[in-house]
């Protein structure tokens, strides 16, 4: 049905007028406006920055916004004793240092308040030692580093290269072997594109350049020292001690001059292979420790910065809903950054806002959602997800029995190359269909559909004809509303070449080289990639607020169960004799995904031909519907990880950025031929199989005919 | 227009101590690694310390190391060169020197430098 139907309202506001009201020279000067200074949480600049948003939501018609603040845990370096790394001589003289501060971009010299490049929540610390380069520092990198090589990073400083998995990760998996610090740097392999050049010349890092971030593993838990529960006024606090995810060695981030300088003197083992060789024209030697002429000297970090209970603030919109006001649609993206945020998140803001005065514009000539939309700032996003975990755990029970959907408004660009979705299956057809009526902003495109281009530059691996879409994993704000509360959950983006640009992320990503030039000379100066992905949030939105039926399809969700399924079936079936001896079948799993898919099927067949003028009957499908999501849900949530409750998807436990599916069984039978008693951890295979087999069948029946 | 502008010297005895100052302008001094360099009567140019963009690094002549520090205020867009244990062969006209653009270069002393001041002369003897 098209949209127009879902309120009483002049054909004339439908989704083409909500689109032809987004404007790129909009969305432009909301950059720059959001980009002159520092927005770190917690700090007055960012508070100010949120009543500038709260007034002009206002302005631009909103029902209602309103601040919702939290007194949460945040960490800062400290001003008059900066944070650094030394290499030390046999008489503890320090004859090398690396940087306090990156090199300001032109133009911002004389901006005050460029907090340091820093690994927020490192505890404080000055341990010495040898240094052992432990590659990306991933779960197989330790692997081999421990287990092939032999090499022992006891007692030692590591360090690690930035990319391929979550920082947080990094430091825990260093932490596990025994590590008495890591230091984190970025290789020119992973942040700096052949044949572009650095900034401000072009969108590559400088030297001098670092990627500051948390290197928390909070595991969804939000606030470390309110787990569960809202920071508000009279929460119970816990002890430092017992904080959640905190890091328990000191951790410091580098650039690729100062990296140069550590790398270059080590000695020990030589890489094992070229996938642990970056481009530094540096040996890559593993450690422990420098070579010949340098083996006597040490490395010495030196961290003094602080964590603090700090108050942060949330703006929270609403557009009330004309039918069903008790249904919500939430736009949610952060608006705090490490400094300027040219593209993290302010890229995703100015989005936001120019949506924001489009719905405003149509609610002014008196169109209403039929849905309630409500619209979110975030805060603390970069300390850990903090803005949106804690008002969602305030406001949990509503959003579980009144959350439709959530799309999440982070960054717009990281790339200017082709779209990028991560969402529930439950949206795949509402992606594929909203993109095939947008027209595509790339060049060779003129005239084709954003789905015609998407799927040209990003073909589905398995559907011939169809554009990839990803899991979502975790790393930003949708996180509590899909992996705890099991609202359907979506997030869209420009992107880069995956085939061409090997490096993680994009180079500047958290530098104080994030800037609005670095997105007017170089990423999207028309900012006609910015109001695509505008058209795609916002006509999401849109879509999900206004159509009478849910666009939610089912059956696309029975056939990723069975794609799941075979996956994690052909994992456990590299043990076969194990299979055997302990008795592990599958059966219920597969069983369970056929009955969700007739059953999905069904009820399908039902949504084409059941009476969308009965008002009880269309609410109850929209409600089947509605509620798939959460039936997904297990309320003991996943081992050791109660805040990631989602059966079929949670971040992996070896990347929080990345998802893995059927989670449970997964971590189960990773690296299970280790285990020192076999028998227990197939019975913890068996156990999750049939937590799986179970939420799938439940969920199923949901589908069911009511009675 | 760059300049780069010092003052400080004067005659000293050996022993003594002096502190040189560089005012700079037409640049943001935070952006780069700078030097002082001297010239003796009748010498070729010899460098005396570099310090990095951010401070973090400081290197020394062997001539003068433990007796001279450089230092610098980047929010006032000076740099400093404190002289202690002066020496007759320290006489020489004082230059403070623009090195690379830390964007491009990471301030070490094989970077070189581009510009420099007029000079202060700096006389120790007795």
């Known amino acids: 049905k098209s949209s127009n139907e879902a309120t009483n309202i002049t054909p004339k506001h439908n989704m083409k007028a909500f689109l032809d009201e987004l404007k790129a020279e909009n969305i432009k000067k909301f950059l720059y406006n959001f980009t002159q200074i520092p927005h770190l949480a917690g700090t007055e600049q960012n508070f100010q920055l949120a009543k500038q948003i709260q007034s002009q939501w206002k302005e631009f018609g909103l029902d209602s916004v309103e601040l919702a603040h939290y007194d949460v845990l945040l960490s800062y370096p400290n001003k008059t004793h900066p944070n650094y790394i030394s290499i030390i001589n046999e008489d503890g003289n320090e004859i090398f240092n690396t940087s306090l501060f990156e090199p300001p971009p032109p133009g911002y010299e004389n901006v005050s308040d460029i907090v340091p490049p820093f690994s927020a929540f490192s505890p404080q610390g000055m341990p010495e030692g040898d240094l052992v380069y432990v590659n990306y520092a991933r779960t197989e990198d330790f692997f081999k580093l421990e287990r092939d090589m032999k090499i022992n990073c006891s007692g030692k400083i590591v360090i690690a290269r930035y990319g391929k998995v979550f920082r947080g990760n990094k430091v825990k998996n260093a932490q596990l072997a025994g590590a008495k610090g890591v230091i984190l740097y970025s290789d020119p392999a992973d942040y700096f594109a052949p044949g572009v050049k650095s900034y401000p010349d072009g969108w590559n890092l400088p030297g001098g350049g670092v990627q500051r971030g948390n290197i928390l593993n909070l595991n969804g838990a939000g606030d470390p020292l309110t787990p569960g529960y809202p920071a508000n006024e009279y929460a119970y606090r816990r002890g430092i001690a017992e904080a959640v995810g905190l890091p328990s060695i000191p951790v410091h981030p580098i650039g690729y001059y100062d990296a140069q300088k550590l790398l270059e003197k080590m000695g020990g083992s030589a890489p094992p292979d070229s996938s642990w060789r970056g481009s530094l024209k540096v040996p890559y030697n593993v450690g422990p420790g420098f070579t010949g002429n340098f083996s006597t000297q040490k490395v010495k970090m030196h961290i003094h910065s602080t964590n603090e209970v700090t108050r942060i603030y949330n703006v929270i919109g609403t557009l009330r809903g004309a039918v069903e006001p008790d249904r919500y649609v939430i736009l949610g993206g952060h608006r705090d950054s490490w400094v300027f945020g040219g593209i993290d998140p302010q890229s995703g803001a100015a989005v936001v806002h120019e949506i924001v005065r489009s719905f405003g514009t149509l609610k002014k000539e008196g169109w209403r959602p039929r849905r309630t939309i409500l619209f979110a700032s975030w805060d603390a996003e970069e300390f850990g997800l903090l803005g949106s975990t804690e008002w969602a755990e305030e406001n949990s029970r509503l959003l579980q029995e009144r959350g439709v959907a959530y799309i999440n408004a982070d960054s717009s660009i990281e790339g200017n190359y082709t779209l990028r979705v991560d969402c529930t299956p439950l949206m795949y057809s509402l992606v594929h269909n909203l993109t095939k009526e947008l027209k595509s902003p790339d060049e060779g495109f003129e005239g084709k559909s954003l789905y015609e281009s998407w799927t040209k530059k990003s073909p589905s691996p398995e559907f011939s004809g169809m554009p990839r879409i990803s899991k979502l994993g975790s790393g930003n704000d949708f996180e509590v509303f899909f992996q705890r509360l099991g609202i359907a959950s979506g997030r869209a983006r420009y992107t880069k070449n995956w085939e061409t640009n090997k490096f993680s992320g994009y180079p500047l990503y958290h530098s104080v080289y994030e800037t609005y030039e670095l997105v007017e000379k170089f990423y999207d100066p028309m900012f006609k990639y910015h109001l695509t992905v505008a058209q795609v949030r916002g006509g999401m939105v849109f879509e999900l607020a206004n159509s009478i039926v849910l666009p939610f399809d089912c059956r696309d969700y029975a056939v990723v169960l069975r794609k799941y399924a075979d996956k994690i079936y052909s994992i456990s079936m590299k043990h076969p004799q194990e299979m055997k001896t302990y008795s592990v079948s599958f059966d219920s799993l597969f069983s369970a995904v056929k009955n969700f898919t007739e059953i999905a099927s069904k009820f399908s067949e039902r949504l084409q031909d059941f009476d969308k003028s009965n008002p009880i009957v269309l609410r109850m499908m929209n409600d089947q519907l509605m509620f798939l999501e959460r039936a997904f849900i297990d309320p003991l949530g996943l081992p050791d990880r109660p805040f990631y409750r989602h059966v079929i998807y949670a971040p992996s436990s070896h990347n929080k950025y990345a998802g893995e599916s059927f989670p449970g069984i997964y971590d189960a039978l990773f690296d299970i031929e280790s285990k020192v008693d076999p028998s227990k951890a197939w019975g913890e295979v068996k156990r999750q199989i049939y937590v799986a087999a179970f939420t799938v069948q439940a969920a199923a029946e949901t589908l069911s005919e009511v009675a | 227009e760059v300049q780069l502008v010092e003052s400080g010297g004067g005659l000293v005895k050996p022993g003594g101590s002096l502190r040189l100052s560089c005012a700079a302008s037409g640049f943001n001094l935070i952006s780069y690694g700078m030097y002082w360099v001297r010239q003796a009567p009748g010498k070729g140019l010899e460098w005396v310390a570099v310090?990095?963009?951010?401070?973090?690094?400081?290197n020394y002549a062997d001539s003068v190391k433990g007796r001279f520090t450089i230092s610098r205020d980047n929010s006032k867009n000076t740099l400093f060169l404190q002289m202690n244990s002066l020496r007759v062969e320290d006489t020489a006209v004082y230059y403070c020197?623009?090195?690379?653009?830390?964007?491009?270069?990471?301030?070490?002393?094989?970077?070189?430098?581009?510009?420099r001041g007029q000079g202060t002369m700096v006389t120790v003897s007795s």
């Open positions: 020197a623009k090195g690379g653009n830390a964007l491009y270069s990471s301030g070490w002393p094989d970077d070189g430098f581009d510009i």
């Open positions: 310090i990095s963009y951010d401070g973090s690094n400081k």
